[in-house]
């Protein structure tokens, strides 16, 4: 959010950018939470739109029997490791080819025992309110497929007829991590020191992170003719003065006619 400044007062404005705003030669460039000529105003709405995609990571171990372990496989930059990685990735891409959420594999460690492969299976899905169910189902299919392939592709008479062979008993799922999307938590974090006053409200299943100064929501504060402004002590109504009236009260709902004040009489609407 930016506000442009022209004229002699600009240099003066530069040193007065507030709340972490920076001067770009023309205006104060404000951080996400602020706006105004000097970044003095707090925004009333923060974009916490759900991420486009949600990811999951499965930590798996399989034992490859069709390759003899050598010390070079421990070195991730070695020719041996790079070749193993390429073949293993190609094999896993075949194994998981029917899973739309499958993104790829990432080898974390190779160790002795034939070749014990510690790796992550990476999954991703478009964000929908049902993302958790989608990823839970995908992780189940991953387990089924890896169990099946490590049972079927085995050494016979000490030789492998497949791209890779496995030890049936060496397949383990260690851990499954799904990226959590918590709009309330995101809203609180992004509102920083104003976190107590920002809330999440939903419209068409989409979350909105708003303060009471944002109009049109159930928590919206009605300041009547005044202006809602956020401060560290919460939302407050700044009441206006017109040519004919002063406005006061918590929601600027009390109007005092100027002519009556000058005539030493008070009149409330």
């Amino acid at each position: 959010r930016t506000t442009t400044c022209f004229g002699d007062g600009c240099q003066n404005t530069a040193s007065r950018c507030k709340n972490g705003g920076t001067w770009d030669g023309l205006k104060c460039q404000c951080p996400n939470l602020y706006y105004g000529e000097l970044c003095e105003e707090v925004v009333s709405s923060i974009d916490i739109g759900p991420p486009e995609t949600i990811s999951a990571q499965m930590e798996l171990t399989v034992t490859v029997t069709s390759v003899k372990f050598t010390e070079e496989l421990k070195n991730h930059s070695s020719q041996e490791f790079q070749e193993f990685k390429q073949t293993f990735t190609e094999q896993m891409n075949i194994v998981y080819s029917g899973i739309p959420e499958y993104v790829g594999v990432n080898i974390t460690k190779l160790r002795l025992g034939s070749v014990v492969v510690e790796h992550d299976v990476l999954l991703r899905t478009k964000y929908t309110p049902e993302y958790k169910t989608v990823l839970d189902n995908a992780t189940e299919v991953v387990k089924e497929k890896i169990t099946k392939v490590t049972t079927q592709q085995i050494m016979i008479n000490d030789i492998c007829s497949d791209m890779m062979c496995f030890n049936t008993t060496g397949t383990q799922v260690q851990n499954i991590t799904v990226t959590q999307y918590d709009p309330e938590e995101d809203c609180r974090k992004m509102a920083k020191e104003y976190g107590d006053y920002f809330v999440v409200e939903y419209r068409d299943q989409k979350p909105y992170c708003i303060s009471p100064c944002e109009p049109g929501f159930s928590v919206s504060k009605n300041c009547n003719l005044g202006k809602c402004q956020m401060s560290l002590s919460g939302p407050q109504c700044l009441c206006v003065t017109t040519e004919t009236h002063w406005y006061s009260g918590e929601t600027c709902n009390q109007g005092t006619q100027k002519s009556l004040v000058y005539g030493h009489h008070h009149h409330h609407h």
Partner: nanobody, 124 residues
Framework: DVQLVESGGGVVQPGGSLRLSCAAS????????MAWFRQAPGKEREVVAF????????YYADSVKGRLTISHDNAKNTLYLQMNSLRAEDTAVYYC?????????????????WGQGTMVTVSS
């Protein structure tokens, strides 16, 4: 990158002999796997034999046992296939394959590096 160049193919009569060679370059280690595969017209590529260059393992397909011998010269980084008692069914394009891993698989998809192939024809 690993480069493989085969030589020694040709036409030979049944019962005759040939020696195929495959010169390898580009390895960072002196311990790796090399293999001979062959592909007859209209058939899938199949393993003939493989060897670990550290001498740890050799393997032969049942159809060539006792007639074909695989060997490797570490000093020359060259793979050989000594072919004796050749038969008409040995006619194929012979490919040299290699891997920086110590492989125990006869599936061609596991072998990343390949030569261009050399033709062996056994005919009277």
């Amino acid at each position: 990158d690993v480069q493989l160049v085969e030589s020694g193919g040709g036409v030979v009569q049944p019962g005759g002999s040939l020696r195929l060679s495959c010169a390898a370059s580009g390895y960072t280690s002196n311990r790796y796997s090399m293999a001979w595969f062959r592909q007859a017209p209209g058939k899938e590529r199949e393993v003939v034999a493989f060897i670990w260059t550290d001498g740890g393992r050799t393997y032969y397909a049942d159809s060539v046992k006792g007639r074909l011998t695989i060997s490797h010269d570490n000093a020359k980084n060259t793979l050989y296939l000594q072919m004796n008692s050749l038969r008409a069914e040995d006619t194929a394009v012979y490919y040299c394959a290699a891997s920086s891993l110590l492989l125990q698989t006869i599936n061609p998809r596991a072998w990343p590096y390949w030569g261009q192939g050399t033709m062996v024809t056994v005919s009277s």
